[in-house]
């Protein structure tokens, strides 16, 4: 039997250095487009393979952006949070909110074939 | 979906005026322009205005007749000309910076990053 899912949630600074196609991820999110509900957040919603953030190697797909240099990404239209990246510079530092899945209870045994080994 | 709406061109006589707006929506917080562009001539820049509205520039040729200015609760702009002359009609476009909470405001068409369609002033 399976324990209850549960979340850790962590913050983390983190520094990019543009690069050539730029910071190399998507976002979703905004107070006109909400990606969570009741949360107009900025997501991570994608990394591109050889970018900047895949080779840091720190941001997640699925991590909350709360600031970029210093600016709130709170209550911000998308295009709004959009532009802030596009004109952020070279050298970038994204405050960040991980959300790590963690289960607590017993763990059932993982079965052969099993697609998350 | 960014978008800028320009209402308020027609046909006016010299020595009129008339009041241009341009609703914005999908961006916020933008540093705004008006320019202009006669048949067969460039665009030019006609007046900035800052994102807080603090802070407006004029081209010289339109210097106290015309007055840009902004209601950020209706995330509208407005260009408001007096004393026309023949040489002011064109189409009027409404341009919005590229950069969310800009600081400088300036007539390069290189900070305008979004544009509505235009509209025409006619002044016989």
């Known amino acids: 039997m399976n324990g209850r899912v549960d979340y850790l949630v962590t913050e983390e600074e983190i520094n990019l250095t543009r690069g050539p196609s730029g910071l190399g991820f998507n976002i979703v999110g905004g107070t006109d487009q909400q990606y969570v509900s009741n949360d107009s957040g900025i997501y991570v919603s994608r990394i591109k393979e050889n970018g900047a953030a895949a080779l840091d190697g720190r941001l997640q797909e699925g991590d909350k952006i709360l600031s970029v240099n210093g600016q709130d990404l709170k209550n911000l239209l998308h295009q709004d949070a959009v532009d802030l990246f596009r004109n952020a510079g070279y050298a970038v530092s994204l405050r960040v909110q991980h959300r790590l899945q963690v289960q607590n209870g017993p763990i059932g045994h993982r079965g052969e074939g099993d697609p998350s080994g | 979906e960014v978008q800028l709406v320009e209402s308020g061109g027609g046909l006016v006589q010299a020595g009129g005026s008339l009041r241009l707006s341009c609703a914005v929506s999908?961006?916020?917080?933008?540093?705004m322009g008006w320019f202009r562009q006669a048949p067969g001539k460039e665009r030019e820049f006609v007046a900035a205005?800052?994102?807080?509205?603090?802070?407006?520039v004029y081209v010289d040729s339109v210097k106290g007749r015309v007055t840009i200015s902004r209601d950020n609760a209706k995330n509208t702009v407005y260009l408001e000309m007096n004393s026309l002359k023949p040489e002011d009609t064109a189409v009027y476009y409404c341009a919005a910076d590229g950069r969310f909470r800009a600081g400088q405001i300036g007539p390069s068409l290189g900070l305008y990053h979004y544009w509505g369609q235009g509209t025409q002033v006619t002044v016989s």
């Open positions: 205005i800052s994102w807080s509205g603090d802070s407006t």
């Open positions: 999908g961006v916020s917080f933008r540093n």
